[in-house]
Amino acid sequence: MNGRVDYLVTEEEINLTRGPSGLGFNIVGGTDQQYVSNDSGIYVSRIKENGAAALDGRLQEGDKILSVNGQDLKNLLHQDAVDLFRNAGYAVSLRVQHRLQVQNGPIGHRGEGDPSG
């Protein structure tokens, strides 16, 4: 019998100061590059070691970014999302969704998304 996999979803506001090498993370997703099945949202695929996000410590690989400086990231092309981040200024406010897997039985499967490939 298969166990049920639940997710504890929390939201958090993260304020980052852009570092010498930018914000210090990579993103995937968008309407033209779906990362999770039936979801065109923008997700964190990699945190750069010693970058701004890593030094802050709250943003995690796999997090969904809901907004940047109050601007919603829904229904954006991937490159439009990239441009929004790159042009977001020195102080950047991110609304993020953390999704923590709560396992009840065998390990489940989260769409086709896998930040590490």
Epitope: S21, G22, L23, G24, F25, N26, I27, V28, D32, Q33, Y35, V44, S45, R46, K48, E49, G51, H78, Q79, V82, F85, R86, E112, D114, P115, S116, G117
Partner: nanobody
Amino acid sequence: HVQLVESGGGLVQAGDSLRLSCAASGITFRWYTMAWFRQAPGKERDFVATINWSGSDTNYADSVKGRFTISRDNAKNTVTLQMNSLQPEDTAVYYCAGVPGTSLSGETDPRDYDYWGQGTQVTVSS
């Protein structure tokens, strides 16, 4: 298990062309930024070129601009580097590299990449 396998290196004369290829497996290739780096004997690994997930955006080191062209085929999980007008100073081991997603930090530092091939030797004689 992630694998990046380069091919196409060899010994050529100055002014000749070579086409390097990198075959990726074990990753969802279409999500990845891909790049080529090179390392000459006794020197650091240097950035050559990078290409975004869709192939619409490329970036080149100044030393190869106008001579080298990076491209990708997401259907075949391959990235290629077409090298024209090769010079002796292009002699190096060429490495394919990949990282998931689009960087908001930079894409020219080897530390920006998670996965690497074993390299292919390119030697240009004068």
